[in-house]
Amino acid sequence: SPGPVPPSTALRELIEELVNITQNQKAPLCNGSMVWSINLTAGMYCAALESLINVSGCSAIEKTQRMLSGFCPHKVSAGQFSSLHVRDTKIEVAQFVKDLLLHLKKLFREGRFN
C-alpha cells in the first residue's frame, strides 16, 4: 500500500488559507483587532494559535485558528499564553497573518515541515 504522506501537504493547506485571507481582505481584517506578536521560532504554531485565539467574532480567521490547532499538541484557550514567551508588542491581525505567511513560506521552501 502507499507509503506515509509527507507532512508538507498539511503545511501547504495552511499557507493557502493564509494567502486566501490576505488576498480577499477588503475592510480591515477582524475590524483592526490587535494581537500579541510572536517569535517565529520553536513552538511557533502553538504561539500563533494562543495569540489568534483571543480574537473572537472574526469569521475570516476561524479556519486559520482551527488549522493551527492541528499543529499544536496541546489544547489552547483564550487568555492562555504558555507558548508566547514574550508579550511586549501588539500588532494588527492583518500584519500578524502576513508575517506568519512569510515565515511559513520560508519553512516550506526549506523543507521544514514539522
Partner: antibody
Framework: EVQLLESGGGLVQPGGSLRLSCAAS????????MSWVRQAPGKGLEWVSA????????YYADSVKGRFTISRDNSKNTLYLQMNSLRAEDTAVYYC????????????????WGQGTTVTVSS | SYELTQPPSVSVSPGQTASITCSGD??????TCWFQQKPGQSPVLVIY???KRPSGIPERFSGSNSGDTATLTISGTQAMDEADYYC?????????FGTGTKVTVLG
Amino acid sequence: EVQLLESGGGLVQPGGSLRLSCAASGFTFSSYAMSWVRQAPGKGLEWVSAFSGSGGSTYYADSVKGRFTISRDNSKNTLYLQMNSLRAEDTAVYYCVQDGLGPYFYNYGMDVWGQGTTVTVSS
Amino acid sequence: SYELTQPPSVSVSPGQTASITCSGDKLGDKYTCWFQQKPGQSPVLVIYHDSKRPSGIPERFSGSNSGDTATLTISGTQAMDEADYYCQAWDSSTYVFGTGTKVTVLG
C-alpha cells in the same frame, strides 16, 4: 463541495472478510486525516480507526485492533477499511469521516461525514 | 479506557433552553466536539473546540467545557432540534464518543 462516498458493505458470515472503500472529492485528500466511525443498530457512535494525513500514522479502537486495517491511496483519493475475522458485534453502519489537518489532526473536529455503508455479520 | 457519560434523554418545551452534559475525567483539558444526528441521517458537527460553531450551525447552539464537564446548550429550542446528540474527545491515541443523549421537543 466536499463529498465522501462509502461502498463495499454487505452481508458476510462470522469469521469472514470485507473491504470498505470511501471515495473523496472536493478537497485535498492527502492533506487530511480520515477516520472510520460505526453505529450498530439502535446504538451510539463508535470510532473505529483513523489514518493521519501528515505522518502516515494509523490508530485503532481496541475492539478492532488486530482484525481491521485502515489504508489510503492518495492518488485515487480513496480511504479503505479491510475487515477480517468479522463478528456479529461488527454489524453496523460504517461512516467515512473527514478529519483534521496536521500531526494533531484530532484537535480539528470531524467536519464531513459520508452517508454510510451497512455491514451485516450473520450466519 | 476513557469514558464520556451523557444523560440518556433530555426533554424541553419549544422556545426553552436544553442543556446536555458530557462528563469525563479532566475533560476540560481536552477539546470537545458535539454532533447532532437525526433518524436515518449521518451525524453533523455542531460544536468544535468546546464552543466554536461551524458555518451554517445556528447561533442557538453553544458549548462550554471546564473541569470534568462539557455542556451543549440549545437556546430557544425548535422542533427541528429533536435528535440524538453525542460529545466527543481524543484520549490516548483514540477518539471517544459520549453515550449519546436523545433530545425530545415537547408539544
